[in-house]
Amino acid sequence: MMTGTIETTGNISAEKGGSIILQCHLSSTTAQVTQVNWEQQDQLLAICNADLGWHISPSFKDRVAPGPGLGLTLQSLTVNDTGEYFCIYHTYPDGTYTGRIFLEVLESSVAEHGARFQIP
């Protein structure tokens, strides 16, 4: 039975040209995390595998950095980066947990972080 929950940074906003950290955290389970995928809509941005380490998609290499931790840093943000991002935790023995983050990239300097929320 899957008892864990994913806590994410929720709805966040950032300025064009700036950077943002996407973070998820798996709690309420003793399952072992074997891999974390970061996806934007249907595009795979990066994978952190417990055995093999990080692999960043070459398409995003110049604008995506691994970490901190299992998170992902997006740099040189553009308005086109606005949208949904997913952290997908592969675990043993539980299976797969998915968290969602919505990022809005703003032209102005009024970007503020949204509240944190949980996805069961």
Partner: antibody
Framework: EVQLQESGPGLVKPSETLSLTCAAS?????????WHWIRQPPGKKLEWMGF???????VYNPSLKGRITISHDTSKNQFSLKLSSVTAADTAVYFC??????????WGQGTTVTVSS | DIQMTQSPSSLSASVGDRVTITCRTS??????LAWYQQKPGKVPKLLIH???TLAEGVPSRFSGSGSGTDFTLTISSLQPEDVATYYC?????????FGQGTKLEIK
């Protein structure tokens, strides 16, 4: 078009070190992807040996740990394999390959290495 | 290590036949499975990754399915140029491992 070409001695004596190089053309080895070595003993299945990232960090097959070293020379756009203390069991066709999320989308032509005295 | 077991080890089929090769893994690899085709004396060629995503330039008669521990490569209508050995490979952990291969021949 990305191309990979292996080179190195075809014959190595037992207990010596096998050294191979893979030259990449059509793509910079520092521009993403991982760069792998895979081998295939005569009539047997493929065996993954290890890889080097564009950053220079490495990951090896635990079965070869202590014997294997993978390095790269970014100025020549090539990466290399060294395998020490070889035995007849290391006789194989050695392939270099480009890795994307740990599957292999581009392969070299392969080079045969025989371990014999 | 994750063990990869392919079946059958060899098979013979006629042109136009539907051919199925299976790969079973010793533990859950989710969808992280690739298939390669190696023609006699040639280099392995990527056919499919992530269980079902066709590599660039691969004919649509090839397809993949499965998840967890059981996976299938299907050739919907066998062609003479499909004579080869087919290997599965997981891309999920260290060490990356391959199946022992399935040798496909034409009747």
């Amino acid at each position: 078009e990305v191309q990979l070409q292996e080179s190195g001695p075809g014959l190595v004596k037992p207990s010596e070190t096998l050294s191979l190089t893979c030259a990449a053309s059509g793509y910079s080895i520092t521009s993403g992807y991982d760069w792998h070595w895979i081998r295939q003993p005569p009539g047997k299945k493929l065996e993954w040996m290890g890889f080097i990232r564009d950053s220079g960090s490495t990951v090896y097959n635990p079965s070869l740990k202590g014997r294997i070293t993978i390095s790269h020379d970014t100025s020549k756009n090539q990466f290399s394999l060294k395998l020490s203390s070889v035995t007849a069991a290391d006789t194989a066709v050695y392939f270099c390959a480009r890795g994307l999320f740990w599957y292999f989308d581009v392969w070299g032509q392969g080079t045969t290495v025989t371990v014999s005295s | 290590d994750i063990q990869m077991t392919q079946s059958p080890s060899s098979l013979s089929a006629s042109v136009g036949d539907r051919v199925t090769i299976t790969c079973r893994t010793s533990e859950n690899i989710f969808s992280y499975l690739a298939w390669y085709q190696q023609k006699p004396g040639k280099v392995p060629k990527l056919l499919i990754h992530n269980t079902k995503t066709l590599a660039e330039g691969v004919p649509s008669r090839f397809s993949g399915s499965g998840s967890g521990t059981d996976f299938t490569l299907t050739i919907s209508s066998l062609q003479p140029e499909d004579v080869a050995t087919y290997y599965c490979q997981h891309h999920y952990g260290n060490p990356l491992t391959f199946g022992q291969g399935t040798k496909l021949e034409i009747k």
